[in-house]
């Protein structure tokens, strides 16, 4: 899948299986990735696993987890808030569009996350204060996680080495791991370019992500993906300017 | 292994709510230094462990971008503390607690939020 | 949580091999150093090994030098100890653990090397 | 190769009463960059080694606040404020600064 990092770093992901995307003392996020066609490197986001963890006066221990084509407005006990506690409201879940689009709001806190299914996959999106993301008292167990330092080098696809040259043939050979694998036809570069367009007309990022994700998988579901990923954005992030992010930032720290 | 602690002093230090260092002032490289110097200073103890060579690639990379020089001035982190997690001892009728931008609003001006996102693939 | 499982231990002729296996799990196996620590019966702790994430360096105590061989496979989350030429003084309860310095250690299993 | 010498080899405490193990290093334990690298493990009776300190004074997760490290240099010390009867075992030094990386002789703690 694709990555943006609590410090605006943009990265593709080929990471399979289970991997920790945010972990503090306050909030677990796993995330499981499945290749998308068989044999290809590229990845996207079939499970999600959120546990909020007991908090003081406020919440309960509360699971929260979403598969493909099962997106709940409640956690795995049933409720929709934070337990019996006395601030058990600042914990809340609410669905906005039933089996798509989900925002739990976790207000103890002060984070608010965004979960939805596009097509098959599932998307996921955090705002929280930069002093929980950095809540981890042990850093060897709660270590590597994506959101805070991005996915490790050998795990990364350069999808815009892969959009310089997707004009020209074998497109999709180059999202894959080894020989292309068997695929429904996916689309022709102009194609792509112009479904992305109508969707995303900024050139940014998540227009790149769109067109890769459309070469690679030829599935037109990946462009409204990356269009509520961009809108997710627009709602989370603090920062207005740096809503939209282009290519010169890619070499930011991607491996530290 | 303290590695991802350096990681965490650095990007605090690169992201604090006053006055984050952008990438090109001498505060990033100050920062840079201190957060490659901390690296050193884990290092036998990371020396196997992914976390270590990840930072240390990336500062390297980060170095040469941003023409930080190896010698000079290095960077404090800034860091407040939330309460811990888990079960209080003070039992609170008040649910102020549980809000945390009110509590926040207590101690500092305003909390500085981050966004992380996935999708796609 | 947590967990490291050796096997692969038991009773070998002097002179001969024997390689042990070490499952982990509850952590990302693929992210971190391991290592490998013996205790003869009765006796202290000593470090025989360890390895890189990505097996790119590996570093030996001088005593199994060119004998023992740490190598691990990431896709199965499992640490290996190939162990040649065994002598007497390598009956030890063999540990393995997590990260470039111990933190976390499996129960261990015995070699006997004895004719 | 370094050498940990621990003393004392034996350390017999009443329950409730401090106790404090030294560890001395054959060479410096600092390297260049100013970081020293010591551990501290305990072995209670049939088990694995668990972690308490790394880095001379961090306390492992889940360690209690009454054990303690300290020490520069060649000379460390683990500390136990008050000693409690789950406390017996064998605590062993452990340099991480020099390759080959090297255990102490360890020491057995026992209640009086």
């Known amino acids: 899948p694709h990555l943006r990092t609590f410090t605006d770093r943009f990265q593709t992901c080929k990471v399979q299986g289970a991997w920790p995307l945010i972990d503090n003392n306050y909030l677990n996020v796993q995330v499981t990735n499945t290749p998308v066609l068989p044999g290809s490197a590229a990845t996207a986001t079939s499970k999600l696993t959120i546990i909020f963890k007991n908090f003081q006066e406020c919440v309960d221990q509360k699971v929260y987890q979403a598969e493909m084509d099962e997106l709940p407005a409640a956690f795995v006990d049933g409720s929709k808030n934070g337990g019996d506690k006395h601030g058990a409201n600042s914990l809340k879940i609410t669905e906005k569009v039933s089996g798509q689009h989900v925002e739990i709001q976790a207000k103890y806190i002060g984070t608010t996350i965004v979960v939805r299914q596009v097509g098959r996959y599932l998307t996921f999106a955090v705002r929280m204060p930069e002093e929980v993301v950095n809540a981890v008292e042990d850093w060897d167990s709660q270590g590597l996680y994506l959101c805070l330092r991005g996915c490790p080098l050998n795990q990364q696809i350069d999808f815009q080495a892969f959009h310089t040259n997707a004009e020209g043939t074998g497109a999709r050979r180059l999202a894959a791991a080894s020989p292309a694998p068997t695929a429904p036809e996916t689309f022709p570069y102009e194609t792509a370019v112009a479904k992305c367009k109508e969707k995303l007309p900024v050139e940014d990022l998540y227009y790149q992500a769109c067109v890769f994700d459309l070469l690679t998988t030829g599935d037109v579901n990946f462009t409204l993906a990356a269009y509520y990923a961009l809108e997710d954005v627009k709602m989370l992030h603090s920062n207005k300017d740096k809503l939209h992010l282009y290519e010169r930032t890619r070499d930011l720290p991607g491996r530290a | 292994c303290k590695i991802l602690k350096c990681n965490s002093e650095f990007w605090s230090a690169t992201s604090g709510s006053h006055a984050p260092a952008s990438d090109d002032t001498p505060e990033f490289c100050a920062a840079l230094r201190s957060y490659a110097l901390c690296t050193r200073r884990t290092a036998r103890t990371c020396r196997g462990d992914l976390a270590y060579h990840s930072a240390v690639h990336g500062i390297e990379d980060l170095m040469s971008q941003h023409n930080c020089s190896k010698d000079g001035p290095t960077s404090q982190p800034r860091l407040r503390t939330l309460p811990p997690a888990g079960d209080s001892q003070e039992r609170s009728d008040s649910p102020e607690i549980c809000h945390y931008e009110k509590s926040f609003h207590k101690h500092s001006a305003t909390p500085n939020y981050t966004h992380c996102g996935l999708f796609g693939d | 949580e947590v967990q490291l499982v050796e096997s692969g231990g038991g009773l070998v002729q002097p002179g001969g091999s024997l390689r042990l296996s070490c499952a982990a799990s509850g952590f990302t196996f693929s992210n971190y150093g391991m290592n490998w620590v013996r205790q003869a019966p009765g006796k202290g702790l000593e470090w025989i090994g360890m390895i890189y994430y990505d097996s790119s360096e590996k570093h030996y105590a001088d005593s199994v030098k060119g004998r023992f061989t740490i190598s691990r496979d990431n896709s199965k989350n499992t640490l290996y100890l190939q162990m040649n030429s065994l002598r007497a003084e390598d009956t030890a309860v063999y540990y393995c653990?997590?990260?470039?310095?111990?933190?976390?250690w499996g129960q261990g299993t015995m070699v006997t090397v004895s004719s | 190769d370094v050498v940990l010498t621990q003393s004392p080899l034996s350390l017999p405490v009443t329950l409730g009463q401090p106790a404090s193990i030294s560890c001395r290093s054959s060479q410096s334990l600092e390297d260049s960059d100013g970081g020293t690298f010591l551990e501290w493990f305990q072995q209670r009776p049939g088990q694995s080694p668990r972690l308490l300190i790394y880095d001379v004074s961090s306390r492992f997760s889940g360690v209690p606040d009454r054990f303690s490290g300290s020490g520069s240099g060649t000379d460390f010390t683990l500390k136990i404020s008050r000693v409690e009867a789950e406390d017996v075992g064998v605590y062993y030094c452990?340099?991480?600064?020099?390759?080959?990386?090297?255990f102490g002789q360890g020491t057995k703690l026992e209640i009086k």
């Open positions: 452990f340099q991480a600064t020099h390759d080959p990386l090297s």
């Open positions: 653990a997590k990260g470039s310095t111990p933190d976390y």
